[in-house]
Amino acid sequence: ILGGREAEAHARPYMASVQLNGAHLCGGVLVAEQWVLSAAHCLEDAADGKVQVLLGAHSLSQPEPSKRLYDVLRAVPHPDSQPDTIDHDLLLLQLSEKATLGPAVRPLPWQRVDRDVAPGTLCDVAGWGIVNHAGRRPDSLQHVLLPVLDRATCNRRTHHDGAITERLMCAESNRRDSCKGDSGGPLVCGGVLEGVVTSGSRVCGNRKKPGIYTRVASYAAWIDSVLA
């Protein structure tokens, strides 16, 4: 997260760290007791590595009573996701067992009504991604509030030049932005999950290259079918 600040500890009990061989790889969001939603591209280079999900964490390194690392029983990338596009960049991870819920671990309601968030709406994005252009990784969860950007502006040639479909949304990126390592994390508007940080290699913090988020409402049928 660029231009953000440290989050209040455990105030986002839905927040997950998707880990590869014990190290933070991507963000994720607990959407059901046994399911975490993340980004499909996150597992592209995972190959034979061990994928796990950390829940109830604020610090990645310090012991915390609510922290627990779960093995992944099943990884379900969206069937239409492809390595070279930002489209359909969603991944559902089934935990090896139902998460132990409590004040620091709780699923987040997700948007089912397929309607765009109004431009200018302030949404919260959180993650353990890099906090500066030098690539410094934080130990504790960071967050930032970002205004939603209308799709027409996001599709301008100097922005994302027509790449933003109706299944994607954008948020402003003027020095405050999601960045590498935040992919798969939640964009939360009014206490509801609206978007998931896409995991393309995008320049961060440049206002002409807005952050791109997959609209979960557009994938309600797929999410429901996997969780069923």
């Epitope: 209308d150 027409a152 599709n155 301008r156 040639r157 100097t158 030049d161 440049n206 002409k208």
Partner: antibody, heavy 116, light 112 residues
Framework: EVQLVESGGGLVQPGGSLRLSCAAS????????MNWVRQAPGKGLEWIGD????????DYNADFKRRFTFSLDTSKSTAYLQMNSLRAEDTAVYYC?????????WGQGTLVTVSS | DIQLTQSPSSLSASVGDRVTITCRSS???????????LEWYQQKPGKAPNLLIY???NRFSGVPSRFSGSGSGTDFTLTISSLQPEDFATYYC?????????FGQGTKVEIK
């Protein structure tokens, strides 16, 4: 299939007004800026300006700012170009073109002739 | 405003010829985001322009590989490696980096 269809062109006297329409189909109208470009007979392409179909924000080439106005009817997925105080040198084919990717999609153009 | 000057204004060539059109801008067209929004369009008589090249050197989908773009800063080139009968048309460069966006005056490619 993305389609842009202009209409409203024709013969108009100097000093007169005309409103051109650009009807869009095959995509979500509010997802892309609409631009207007004109081409005088035997001449090059000239950008008039653009409009954001979500916010209605506009940007005009300074040469056209006083006499030309963009508007929208999102319920009809249509953009409009209102042209006032027309002069002989405004005689041209007028195009609408969607921005994103680049100017990949253009209408067929509508000819405006300003003459007495 | 940024002026784009194309050369030549017209040229005569034969099928199979290699054709090069240059476009020079009055100032740099590198955008503040680091990209260069220099595009090339082909226009045939009575028709709307067609996008060939975007961001200096990227071919738009469906554009034949004989069309290529290059350049940087203020000097740009469109090359047609082996001219085909359907390539006789007028070509325009365009800059989208700075408002107002502008087109070059055009280069007409005619049959020799």
């Amino acid at each position: 299939e993305v389609q842009l269809v202009e209409s409203g062109g024709g013969l108009v006297q100097p000093g007169g007004s005309l409103r051109l329409s650009c009807a869009a189909s095959g995509y979500t109208f509010t997802s892309y800026y609409m631009n207007w470009v004109r081409q005088a007979p035997g001449k090059g392409l000239e950008w008039i300006g653009d409009i954001n179909p979500v916010t209605g924000d506009t940007d005009y080439n300074a040469d056209f700012k006083r006499r030309f106005t963009f508007s929208l009817d999102t319920s009809k997925s249509t953009a409009y170009l209102q042209m006032n105080s027309l002069r002989a040198e405004d005689t041209a084919v007028y195009y609408c073109t969607r921005e994103g990717p680049s100017f990949a999609y253009w209408g067929q153009g509508t000819l405006v002739t300003v003459s007495s | 405003d940024i002026q784009l000057t194309q050369s030549p204004s017209s040229l005569s060539a034969s099928v199979g010829d290699r054709v090069t059109i240059t476009c020079r801008s009055s100032q740099t067209i590198v955008h503040s985001n680091g990209d260069t929004y220099l595009e090339w369009y082909q226009q045939k008589p009575g028709k709307a322009p067609n996008l060939l090249i975007y961001k200096v050197s990227n071919r738009f989908s469906g554009v034949p590989s004989r069309f290529s773009g290059s350049g940087s800063g203020t000097d740009f080139t469109l090359t047609i490696s082996s001219l085909q009968p359907e390539d006789f048309a007028t070509y325009y460069c365009f800059q989208g980096s700075h408002v107002p966006v502008t087109f070059g005056q055009g280069t007409k490619v005619e049959i020799k």
